[in-house]
């Protein structure tokens, strides 16, 4: 399992599908203006492993790529924080690490990554189909959430792990993936935009094979660049798609598809697509105490309607806390 | 209801000891560090130590180093504070306070008040 | 450890003023700060957490601002239940550390 920036592929257009065509022309740019601007936006990656020698001993390990110093890390299974999740661990760059049963070790590996071990024995051991969530608060950036689970057919005694990348530290292939996509990028709108200036701009029409594809597509600069300029991406880097998206991204909208920025809503087309799709991470600047008080029956700020994406106008905060808003 | 209830005052002559309980109710004590927190007359507030009450980890004021000892009864959820080798400069009001790690003190103890007089 | 220093250390206002209180710390401390009403004889009561947030039950006249090392609570209309000594807590590092107190008396 490897932790990688996630591109979206260009495709070529497809070919016959002349208004579409001059459509994407008009689109490319929008989505390569919206990939340069989202080049920063800090990412969280998650990645679960069971453990050969113990079949119910799972090691949680996630990282943040982003430039911001972290303030707190907090782990937690069942889904995201928010949604019912049950905190495993928090760690605490100055103040050290709390874990609860069943975490056996919690522990920073590096500034920005920790790992998890759980115990695999007892009522409140994880089973397979687990969602394990990360959340990492970046001050004064905000927070950003990621979560993952194992593949429900994996058997570590009976099929090999998976075979690891080439030992390639995550934020710098973050940082290098990110910059040869830029770099392409930039080199392939300007060579849209010399190819737009010698030859007259295709009329947009609707296309024969499908009624509502300009409608889907007029959609994506506007809808598309917003969502990706705002919502932090997560890469889950699990070869399985999580037990329950709608518990995993309660934020997602009608459905999960539909929350994805257009250039990352490719369905995949299986466990190994599922492995590389990013999904939004719920960037908030709200506090992490928010959830932390349900359980006394206290208020956690306000945070306006819905959920926050940008900097709260009354200074930053940490996160959502573990234990679910109300 | 939340809520953290502390043993009542004591007087205690120098060099004794004293220990302090906070029994807690209506949260999940081992989620939370509870913290101790003391008060003089006519002082400010002074944080003398933590507990974990899962892990059953602690530390202390380093003021306060070998004299004071934080320790935890999970089954009847109270946390206790003792002080030892008492003087005249630790007569204050004592606190247990509640926290969710990492976000400081929320709900506390009514406190205690210890005297400390030969 | 880290220091955390009031200012003022005591002031007197009238009800329906407009109340701000400051407090320092020695080094950066995020907003990882509490806000505290002491009234002798009772126990210390968190008005605000994380700097600006504030505690539920408590009345929206008092609020919290500041990050890093500079903060303040501001009360935006004193009552006569208001008059009471507020502290900062940093809980960004052990120790935790308490500032030294302002206390609001009435004019």
């Known amino acids: 399992m490897r932790t990688e920036a996630q591109v979206p592929a260009l495709q070529p257009p497809e070919p016959g599908l002349e208004g579409a065509m001059g459509h994407r022309t008009l689109v490319l740019p929008w989505v390569l203006l919206t990939l340069c601007v989202t080049a920063g936006t800090p990412e969280v990656w998650v990645q679960v492993r069971m453990e050969a020698t113990e079949l119910s001993s799972f090691t949680i390990r996630c990282g943040f790529l982003g430039s911001g110093s972290i303030s707190l890390v907090t782990v937690s299974w069942g889904g995201p924080n928010g949604a019912g999740g049950t905190t495993l661990a928090v760690l605490h760059p100055e103040r050290g690490i709390r874990q609860w049963a069943p975490a056996r070790q919690a522990r920073w590996e590096t500034q920005s990554s920790i790992s998890l071990i759980l115990e695999g024995s007892g009522a409140s051991s994880p089973c397979a189909n687990t969602t394990f969530c990360c959340k990492f608060a970046s001050f004064p950036e905000g927070s950003w959430e990621a979560c993952g689970s194992l593949p429900p057919s994996s058997d570590p005694g009976l099929s090999a792990p998976p075979t690891p990348a080439p030992i390639l530290r995550a934020d710098l292939a973050g940082i290098l993936g990110v910059s040869g996509v830029l770099l392409f990028g930039c080199v392939y709108l300007l060579h849209l935009l010399r190819r737009h200036k010698h030859r007259p701009a295709p009329r947009l029409q609707p296309s024969r094979t499908s009624p509502q594809a300009p409608r889907a597509r007029a959609w994506a600069p506007s809808q598309a660049s917003q969502a990706a300029l705002h919502v932090p991406y997560a890469t889950i880097n699990t070869s399985c798609r999580p037990a329950t998206l709608d518990t995993a991204h309660p934020h997602g909208g009608p459905s999960w598809w539909a929350s994805l920025p257009t250039h990352a809503a490719h369905r995949p087309q299986g466990p190994a697509a599922w492995a590389s799709t990013p999904i939004p991470a719920r960037g908030s600047f709200v506090s992490v105490e928010n959830g932390l008080y349900a359980q006394a029956g206290e208020r956690p700020p306000h945070t306006g309607p819905g959920l926050t994406l940008f900097p709260d106008p009354r200074g930053p905060r940490a996160m959502e806390g573990p234990l679910g808003v109300r | 209801q939340v809520q953290l209830v502390q043993s009542g005052g004591e007087v205690k002559k120098p060099g004794a000891s004293v220990k302090v309980s906070c029994k807690a109710s209506?949260?999940?004590?081992?989620?939370?560090?509870i913290n101790w927190v003391r008060q003089a007359t006519g002082q400010g507030l002074e944080w003398m130590g933590w507990?974990?009450?899962?892990?059953?980890?602690?530390d202390y004021a380093q003021k306060l180093q070998g004299r004071v000892i934080i320790t935890r009864n999970t089954s009847i959820t109270t946390a206790y504070m003792e002080l030892s080798s008492l003087r005249s400069e630790d007569t204050a009001v004592y606190y247990c306070?509640?926290?969710?790690?990492?976000?400081?003190?929320?709900?506390w103890g009514q406190g205690t008040t210890v005297t400390v007089s030969s | 450890d880290i220091q955390m220093t009031h200012s003022p250390s005591s002031l007197s206002a009238s009800i329906g003023d407009r109340v701000t209180i400051t407090c320092r710390a020695s080094?950066?401390?995020?907003?990882?700060l509490g806000w505290y009403q002491k009234k002798p004889g009772k126990a210390p009561k968190r008005l605000i957490y994380?700097?600006?947030s504030l505690q539920s039950g408590v009345p929206s006249r008092f609020s919290g601002s500041g990050s890093g090392t500079e903060f303040t609570l501001t009360i935006s209309s004193l009552q006569p239940e208001d008059f009471a000594t507020y502290y900062c807590?940093?809980?960004?590092?052990?120790?935790?550390?308490f500032g030294g107190g302002t206390k609001v008396e009435i004019k």
């Open positions: 080094q950066g401390i995020r907003n990882e």
């Open positions: 807590l940093q809980h960004n590092t052990y120790p935790l550390t």
């Open positions: 209506g949260f999940t004590f081992t989620s939370y560090d």
């Open positions: 507990m974990n009450h899962y892990s059953g980890d602690s």
């Open positions: 306070g509640r926290e969710r790690f990492p976000f400081g003190m929320d709900v």
């Open positions: 994380s700097a600006s």
